[in-house]
Structure formats: structure tokens, C-alpha cells
């Protein structure tokens, strides 16, 4: 669609174009089982444009449906380590707050590899915290081309 | 300037326990996974365990699986490898190593080492 | 788990000249994810090279780690007395991460 002249005079933030994508930063502790994020120009290729950081934790400032998409690459791996152990060792995505909107995204599961990645179109809304949940005794790359977490406004 | 102090090896009897620790300096010791990694004299060496930079996820190799518990203090910028129902096999030197930024386990930095010999 | 195996034993060389190194993997090393350490008497290991090629801080330019999939090489071009030691490699790209059992260069 073509844009007015008022349009184009409009940073991107103001036409709803939310955009953000983040670098791993750490795990949590013990019986923590999120990933904590980070993101800016001074950390390299990751930013928030319009979403923000809530200790480490992804929220929602504009109403509309995202794409939402994750890569996680793992780096203590092996195909036994990513199928043997009795905890489920998945990775999932969902919105943890607030709790009247929680609800599971995305659902992965590493089964014999190292790397996961996924992405959907899913609606949220203002104030939404999305969280991201590794289960099992594995731990993340941090490396900025293997392990990464973004969502994109695509429309209202 | 990175350092790795390790303390706590020494002479113990088979069956018994003991307990390492690994002092860090120089870096922000919670923002890196660490391991311990051990050497049996004239032998090649062996990963034994690592530990997140949170302190929340551990790893062990199958030859220490249920014996050995890696822990950390924050805190205190300290490592620990408490050793239970040890053998003579566990006889080694015992490295603490930190991990890469990326959390792979490769070791940038080491610890001199303490000598744990288990025997009767 | 994968095992490593590194040639030769031993390697008699003179101060100048060029030491070659292998490590072979018992199976391909995911995105070749290997380390070479160095160590000398009485001293904890010494990274070298990582992901096979790229020099850790600090390490001179003499030193270089080339190959892929299963078989890997350190070059030390023009050896310095200081670096007649036991070189080892280890492998990060599957758990359990392993060594090989090391190659000593010492002076010929």
C-alpha cells in the first residue's frame, strides 16, 4: 500500500512497524528454566525497534499479529545427550505475561540434533511478555549466528 | 589479567570425599560457563564436568556421572567439584578452565592445578 | 564419543624449522569445532586455536590450524625455543567434549 505524505514523514516506530531481534545473554538459575535475552547496536547485530527488554524477557508495546521466530543452537551437544535424558529437552516459546494471556507459541524439540528454529504468525498485544523455556540439561550457544530470538508487526 | 586458583586436591582413601575450589579473578565470573578438566599423571587429559554461568544447568562425564557434583558461588567467584566415592582412577590433576564467551567448551584460561591422589 | 587420535608421538625437530601436527576424529567434528592447546612441564595447557583455525589472543602468527570433517593440522612455522612442548587437541562440537593424547615436539 502506498504511504501519504504525512505517512512518510512518520519514524517507522509510529506506523506500527515493531521489529526486534536479540542475542542470547545467559540462562537462568536452578529451577529457572528461561532463556534471558539482550539486544542492541552495541552488542552487535541484535535491536529493539518499538518492543523492549524486561530483564531479559521480550515485551510487546503495539498491538498486532507478529511473526514471531527462534533459532537456538546448543553447545554442549551430542545425539545421545538430546535424546537420552528423562526430562522432555524442548525448547518452548510462549507468553508468560500477563497471566490472564498465557499460552504456549511454539514447541520444539531437539531429538538428535543441535539446533532448533522455528517461526509463526501469531496476535499480541500491548504488554504481552514472551518468554522462551529450555527444559533439560542443555546448554545455549551464544554465538550471534547460532542462537537468536526476534518478532516482526506485520499488521494490525 | 584472568585468574584461576584451584585448591583442595591432596591424599585421600578410596571411598572417601573431597572437595576442590576454584578462586576466579579478572572477569565476570558469572557471565561465563566453566569446567573441570583432569589429567592422571603421564595421561592424556579428560573433561570431568561444567557448570553454566547462572549456576542452573550441569554436565558430567559417564565416568564421574553420580559421584561428582560442579557447583558455583557467585558470589564468591568461586567454582567447587565436591568428589564422592572416589577411586583410584580419580587420581589426576584437576584443572578448572573457563569456558568461551559462547559457552562452548573450549578453554580460554586454566588454573595451575591441584593434585588429588586417591589411594590407600 | 568421538575419539582423537594425534600423530606422531613424538616429533624431533630444530629450532627453525616447521612442526605438522594431525589429529584425526573418529567422526566428522560438527562445524569444526576443534582446539589445539599447548603445555608445557609442570603448567596448565595454553589455547592455541580454536573452530580449527582462528588464533586465540595473544598467540603468534606462527602458529595456524587448518582442515575439516575429520582430520585437522597445526602448522608451527619456524620453531622458537619456547615452543618445544606437548601440543593437544580437543574437540567441542559433540558431548562429551574429548582430547587427543597429545604430541610432544622436542628438540632434535
Known amino acids: 500500500q502506498r504511504l501519504s505524505r504525512a505517512q512518510q514523514q512518520l519514524p517507522l516506530e509510529s506506523l506500527g512497524w515493531d521489529i526486534a531481534e536479540l542475542q542470547l545473554n545467559h540462562t537462568g538459575p536452578q529451577q529457572d528454566p528461561r532463556l534471558y535475552w539482550q539486544g542492541g547496536p552495541a552488542l552487535g547485530r541484535s535491536f529493539l525497534r518499538g518492543p523492549e527488554l524486561d530483564k531479559g524477557q521480550l515485551r510487546i508495546r503495539r498491538d498486532g499479529i507478529y511473526m514471531v521466530h527462534i533459532q537456538v543452537t546448543l553447545a554442549i551437544c551430542s545425539s545421545t545427550s538430546t535424546s537420552r535424558h528423562h526430562h522432555p529437552t524442548t525448547l518452548a516459546v510462549g507468553i508468560c505475561s500477563p497471566a490472564s494471556r498465557s499460552i504456549s507459541l511454539l514447541r520444539l524439540s531437539f531429538h538428535q540434533g543441535c539446533t532448533i528454529a522455528s517461526q509463526r504468525l501469531t496476535p499480541l498485544a500491548r504488554g504481552d511478555t514472551l518468554c522462551t523455556n529450555l527444559t533439560g540439561t542443555l546448554l545455549p550457544s551464544r554465538n550471534t549466528d547460532e542462537t537468536f530470538f526476534g518478532v516482526q508487526w506485520v499488521r494490525p | 589479567e584472568v585468574q584461576l586458583l584451584e585448591s583442595g586436591g591432596g591424599v585421600v582413601q578410596p571411598g572417601r570425599s573431597l572437595r576442590l575450589s576454584c578462586a576466579a579473578s579478572?572477569?565476570?565470573?558469572?557471565?561465563?560457563?566453566m569446567s573441570w578438566v583432569r589429567q592422571a599423571p603421564g595421561k592424556c587429559l579428560e573433561w570431568v564436568s561444567a557448570?553454566?554461568?547462572?549456576?542452573?544447568?550441569?554436565f558430567y562425564a559417564e565416568s564421574v556421572e553420580g559421584r561428582f557434583t560442579i557447583s558455583r558461588d557467585n558470589s564468591k567467584n568461586t567454582l567447587y567439584l565436591q568428589m564422592n566415592s572416589l577411586r583410584a582412577e580419580d587420581t589426576a590433576v584437576y584443572y578448572c578452565?573457563?569456558?568461551?564467551?559462547?559457552?562452548?567448551?573450549?578453554?580460554?584460561?586454566w588454573g595451575q592445578g591441584t593434585l588429588v591422589t586417591v589411594s590407600s | 564419543e568421538i575419539v582423537l587420535t594425534q600423530s606422531p608421538g613424538t616429533l624431533s625437530l630444530s629450532p627453525g624449522e616447521r612442526a605438522t601436527l594431525s589429529c584425526r576424529a573418529s567422526?566428522?567434528?560438527?562445524?569444526?569445532?576443534l582446539a589445539w592447546y599447548q603445555q608445557k612441564p609442570g603448567q596448565a595447557p595454553r589455547l592455541l586455536i580454536y573452530?580449527?583455525?582462528s588464533r586465540a589472543t595473544g598467540i603468534p602468527d606462527r602458529f595456524s590450524g587448518s582442515g575439516s570433517g575429520t582430520d585437522f593440522t597445526l602448522t608451527i612455522n619456524r620453531l622458537e625455543p619456547e615452543d618445544f612442548a606437548v601440543y593437544y587437541c580437543?574437540?567441542?562440537?559433540?558431548?562429551?567434549?574429548?582430547f587427543g593424547c597429545g604430541t610432544k615436539v622436542d628438540i632434535k
Open positions: 578452565a573457563k569456558h568461551d564467551y559462547s559457552n562452548y567448551p573450549y578453554f580460554d584460561y
Open positions: 579478572g572477569f565476570t565470573f558469572s557471565s561465563y560457563a
Open positions: 557448570i553454566s554461568g547462572s549456576g542452573g544447568r550441569t
Open positions: 567422526q566428522s567434528v560438527r562445524s569444526n569445532y
Open positions: 573452530g580449527a583455525s
Open positions: 580437543q574437540q567441542y562440537g559433540s558431548s562429551p567434549p574429548t
